[in-house]
Each structure stands twice: as C-alpha cells, then as structure tokens.
C-alpha cells in the first residue's frame, strides 16, 4: 500500500486521489478512513454512501477513484484507504495520510523584559499564540534570523524607532505581528 501525505487548511474542500490510473474493469472500489470504516463503496455501477461523519459532504468519482470531501475539519485527520477489488478478485490499496491544520491566528507580542543597561536597551519579547504547533521567525534589525518564540536583543542608542516582526507559520498559513520601540527604550506601538 503506497502512502501519500497531504496537509490542508481546515474549512477547505479536499480531493483525495491517486496519481496512477485505476486497474482496468475493476469490480469494486471502497474508500475507508482508519483501517475499516467505510465512507463510500462503488459496486455494480452504483455508489453507496455509508452512515459516517462524512455523509453529506463526500462525493466519489468512480472514473478516477477520487474522493471529494467538503469543509474538512481537524477531526478529519486520518489515514484514508482506497481499496480496489480487481477483476481477478484480488484487492489493491492506496493510502493517503491527511493532516488538517487550522490557519494560524495573529500572534500577540508580549514584552517579557525591558531595561536600560549602560545606555543600551535590553529587550526580551515573546511571540504568543494559543496552543499551536508552529514555526516562529523574527525579522528586524537583528544580527541573525531568530527562529524561536522568544527574541532577546540589545539596542544601541538610536534616533529612530526600531520594529520587530514575529511571523508564525504552519504548512498551510502564516501571520505576522509587529512591535516597535522608540529611543531610548520605549514601547511605541504594535
């Protein structure tokens, strides 16, 4: 059973399909979620949709074997299995591991620490979003790109505002939050 990985954003419509053509003159085609929960079965020229959480929001294309699912949610995370009963009576199967992710919310930047140290401004900022598994990247006048939820930096005396942007992203979306400081060490705006 070949396994394909798919990551999609929640609320979207998804097409689960295989990249190869179906066996010729197959007898039966069934889509399952997990190992043995039937979603839809095509047999003798008819599609039967089973009582499941997908009923009413799935459609099968018997030509290609594609399964269309509308408005996917995180609860739809699963391994989907398409099993085809070939004319010789043996089955062939393909697996698609579907990961549904919510779009990331806009991050909130919090000042964890701010103090004057020898005319310099020491800053510790944290980029916060509720309980998500995401990637963080800080942008601004920084010695190097920081990929962490916390930014620690020291500002030398400066004339203009300095702004720092935190970008949070997962594989389906990204959002930015920005915080600016006026000299010497004053939070200006976000």
């Amino acid at each position: 059973g070949r396994l394909v990985h798919m990551t999609v954003v929640s609320g979207s419509n998804v097409t689960l399909n295989i990249s190869e053509s179906l066996p010729e003159n197959y007898k039966q085609l069934t889509w399952f979620y997990t190992f043995d929960q039937k979603i839809v079965e095509w047999d003798s020229g008819k599609s039967k949709y089973f009582e499941s959480k997908f009923k009413g929001r799935v459609r099968l294309d018997p030509q290609s074997g594609a399964l269309y699912i509308s408005k996917v949610q995180k609860e739809d995370n699963s391994t989907y299995v398409m099993r085809v009963l070939k004319k010789d009576g043996y089955e062939q199967e393909w697996k698609i591991k579907l990961q549904v992710l919510d779009p990331v919310p806009k991050p909130v930047i919090k000042i964890e620490k701010r103090e004057d140290v020898d005319d310099n401004c020491y800053l510790k900022l944290s980029c916060v979003i509720p309980g998500e598994s995401v990637n963080y990247t800080w942008y601004g006048e920084l010695p190097k790109e920081i990929q962490n939820s916390v930014l620690e930096t020291t500002l030398k005396p400066h004339k203009h505002s300095r702004c720092y942007t935190c970008q949070v992203s997962n594989s389906v979306s990204s959002k930015n939050g920005t915080f600016c400081f006026s000299p010497p060490c004053t939070a200006a705006r976000s």
Epitope: T34, Q37, K38, F50, E93, K95
Partner: antibody
Framework: EGQLLESGGGLAQPGGSLRLSCAAS????????MSWVRQAPGKGLEWVSL????????YHADSVKGRFTISRDNSKNTLYLQMNSLRAEDTAVYYC???????????WGQGTLVTVSS | EIVLTQSPGTLSLSPGERATLSCRAS???????LAWYQQKPGQAPRLLIY???SRATDIPDRFSGSGSGTDFTLTISRLEPEDFAVYYC?????????FGQGTKVEIK
C-alpha cells in the same frame, strides 16, 4: 468451504515472544482481509489484529499496540501474529478468522492456546 | 468505542422453548451493522446473523435477528439440543469493532 488452522501456541514467560501461524486452505487466501481474535479463559471475545487482503495495511487493538505485529504471506496462504513483550493478561485462545468484507468474522480456525506464566 | 451489553448473562430453558437474547449498544449502531455468533464449548465461534437480521449460510431458520439503533435481539424459536451454547453479538458500524460479553443458553 475454506479452512483455517492455527499453530504456534504454547507456554511463554512474561516478557517473552511467540509467533502464531494460521494456514488457510480451500480459499483464495489473498482475496481476504484477515484477523486475530482472542478469548481469555472463561471470558468473551476480543479482536486483536487486522490485516488487509494485500497486506498493505494493518490495525491493532490498543491493548497489544507496539507489542504484536500481524503479517501475511499470500504465496504461502499463511497469516502470522508475532507476539513480543508478552504479559500474563495475553493468556488466551487465539483464533484466526477471515475479516469478511471488513465487517464480521467468518469463518474461524479452531484456535491455539497461548499461556503466559513464569 | 461502542460498548455492547448482553442480557441475560445466563438463560436456562428446555428444548422446544423459545429463547430471546438481548444486545444493547452504548450508542446507535450505524446501519444496524450487528452480527451474532454461536460458540459451543471447546469450539470456535460460528457466524449466525449479520446486518442485524440476515441469516448466514446454512443457518437454520429457527434463528432470527431483529432490532435497530441501540437494541438488538436474537431469537431461537424452538430450542434444539445442539443450540445450547454461548452467543455473542458484535458491531461493525464503527471502529474499533467490539463484542458483547456473551449470553449462555443452558439446559434447564
């Protein structure tokens, strides 16, 4: 009418291993999903492991996940259950059965007894 | 997971009598996907009924299944001596598949 015959049961120490086999005859074995179902002495039935006809996907009960592995060799018409890290509570008669259309279990083998004890 | 509760635990009847076995599910079994098995001492289970009411191959017509939703019944219209055994229900409407704990039909 197909027949299923289990073997490989016996006495094992806690933490030990056993490998059960189920030989199929009278059926085109590769066309069927298969299962292992167990029955502890004097108790009810509990499915243990499932495998698709092609062997491409498997499914295990939480109670055995990470310890038991189901597999099949369609060229030999044989189903296997590799049982590792055995516990006293794995003591049972183990049946293999055809997992008919991924729904019910029919027919069944006669069973093989696995006893886990020190 | 769906929990199946069978009642009574033991049914004491005489040959020729009618046996009524109950299987109750903790939540609705979709499409009435329920099977019944018979198991005699020292033997493997045997499929009797699938889809709540369809008799399996070679099962005598004194065995019948009925019910829907959460309540299912296996009826043996006239008990024959070979019918004294333990009976199990099993649902296949949702994963994981589950069995009831069994009902023993014994000779009174």
């Amino acid at each position: 009418e197909g027949q299923l015959l289990e073997s490989g049961g016996g006495l094992a120490q806690p933490g030990g291993s056993l490998r059960l086999s189920c030989a199929a005859s009278g059926i085109t074995f590769g066309r069927y999903a298969m299962s292992w179902v167990r029955q502890a002495p004097g108790k009810g039935l509990e499915w243990v492991s499932l495998i698709s006809g092609s062997g491409g996907s498997t499914y295990h009960a939480d109670s055995v996940k990470g310890r038991f592995t189901i597999s099949r060799d369609n060229s030999k018409n044989t189903l296997y259950l590799q049982m590792n890290s055995l516990r006293a509570e794995d003591t049972a008669v183990y049946y293999c059965a055809i997992y008919n259309n991924y729904n019910w279990f029919d027919p069944w083998g006669q069973g093989t007894l696995v006893t886990v004890s020190s | 997971e769906i929990v199946l509760t069978q009642s009574p635990g033991t049914l004491s009847l005489s040959p020729g009598e009618r046996a009524t076995l109950s299987c109750r599910a903790s939540q609705s079994v979709s499409s009435n996907y329920l099977a019944w098995y018979q198991q005699k001492p020292g033997q493997a289970p045997r499929l009797l009924i699938y889809d709540a009411s369809s008799r399996a191959t070679d099962i005598p017509d004194r065995f019948s299944g009925s019910g829907s939703g959460t309540d299912f019944t296996l009826t043996i219209s006239r008990l024959e001596p070979e019918d004294f055994a333990v009976y199990y229900c099993q649902q296949y409407g949702s994963s994981p598949r589950t069995f009831g704990q069994g009902t023993k039909v014994e000779i009174k």
